[in-house]
Amino acid sequence: MMTGTIETTGNISAEKGGSIILQCHLSSTTAQVTQVNWEQQDQLLAICNADLGWHISPSFKDRVAPGPGLGLTLQSLTVNDTGEYFCIYHTYPDGTYTGRIFLEVLESSVAEHGARFQIP
């Protein structure tokens, strides 16, 4: 039975040209994480494999940095980066957990950042 929950940064906004941390945290389960995938709509941004670590998709290598933790840092943001991001936790014995984050990239310098989520 899947008892875990994924906490995310929720809906966040950031300035064009800036950077943002996408963060998810799996809690309320003793399941072991085998791999975490980060996806933007249908595109894979990165994976973090429990054995082999971080692998950033070649098409995003210049603008995506691993971490902190199992989170992902997006850099040099453009308006086209606006949209849904998903963290997909592959675990055993539970199976797969998915978290959703909506990022809005604003032209304005008054972008209101969502509260930064910290893994305890």
Partner: antibody, heavy 125, light 106 residues
């Protein structure tokens, strides 16, 4: 076509080291992990560990920790497995194998679809 | 480490028979299980991944099922080329193999 070609058979003395190579062709080497599996004569398959050809990170079977080193040379699309302080019970056929899933497929890594032909390593005094 | 126990260790069957091999994990591994076929002197060949997905190019008479701790490989109608040894392997760290099941001609 996609293939892995391993180096030839080796005969080693106890205490020596062996380095087996595994040359990949027919696919993008840095997009898939490489695993190593061995099989003692008449026995089953034993997982040794694996390496990411993308970032060089490794994970080894606990039993072999400290004696095994896996590396890759991306310029030649070749993976290597070195085993040190050889003992008679290291006598086995050593296989390299490509992960069935690309890092960019989003699938969980772990199955192996393309295997080398195997390298027989005999440890004998 | 998670232990993988295969049964039976060997079996005798005839061409056309339905053959079932089981693999039990010492703790739940969700669907992270693969099946391989190995013939004497040859490298293993991937048949089934993620418990039930048929690897490309593998005949449809092979099927896999199960999740959690109990898994099954079924050959619906055994063919002469299917006489071999079959191994399960779990895909969670540290990716151990079962002991193998040798399928022999009756």
């Amino acid at each position: 076509q996609v293939q892995l070609v391993q180096s030839g058979a080796e005969v080693k003395k106890p205490g020596a080291s062996v380095k087996v190579s595994c040359k990949a062709s027919g696919y993008t080497f840095t997009s898939y992990p490489i695993g190593w599996v061995r099989q003692a004569p008449g026995q089953g398959l034993e997982w040794m560990g694996w390496i990411s050809s993308y970032n060089g990170n490794t994970n080894y079977a606990q039993k072999l920790q400290g004696r095994v080193t896996m590396t890759t040379d991306t310029s030649t699309s070749t993976a290597y497995m070195e085993l040190r302080s050889l003992r008679s019970d290291d006598t086995a056929v050593y296989y390299c194998a490509r992960g069935a899933s690309s890092f960019w497929s989003g699938d969980v890594l772990g199955a192996f679809d393309i295997w080398g032909q195997g390298t027989m390593v005999t440890v004998s005094s | 480490d998670i232990q993988m126990t295969q049964s039976p260790s060997s079996l005798s069957a005839s061409v056309g028979d339905r053959v079932t091999i089981t693999c039990r994990a010492s703790q739940s591994i969700s669907s992270y299980l693969n099946w391989y076929q190995q013939k004497p002197g040859k490298a293993p060949k991937l048949l089934i991944y993620a418990a039930s997905s048929l690897q490309s190019g593998v005949p449809s008479r092979f099927s896999g099922s199960g999740s959690g701790t109990d898994f099954t490989l079924t050959i619906s109608s055994l063919q002469p080329e299917d006489f071999a040894t079959y191994y399960c392997q779990q895909s969670v760290p540290p990716r151990t193999f079962g002991g193998g099941t040798k399928v022999e001609i009756k």
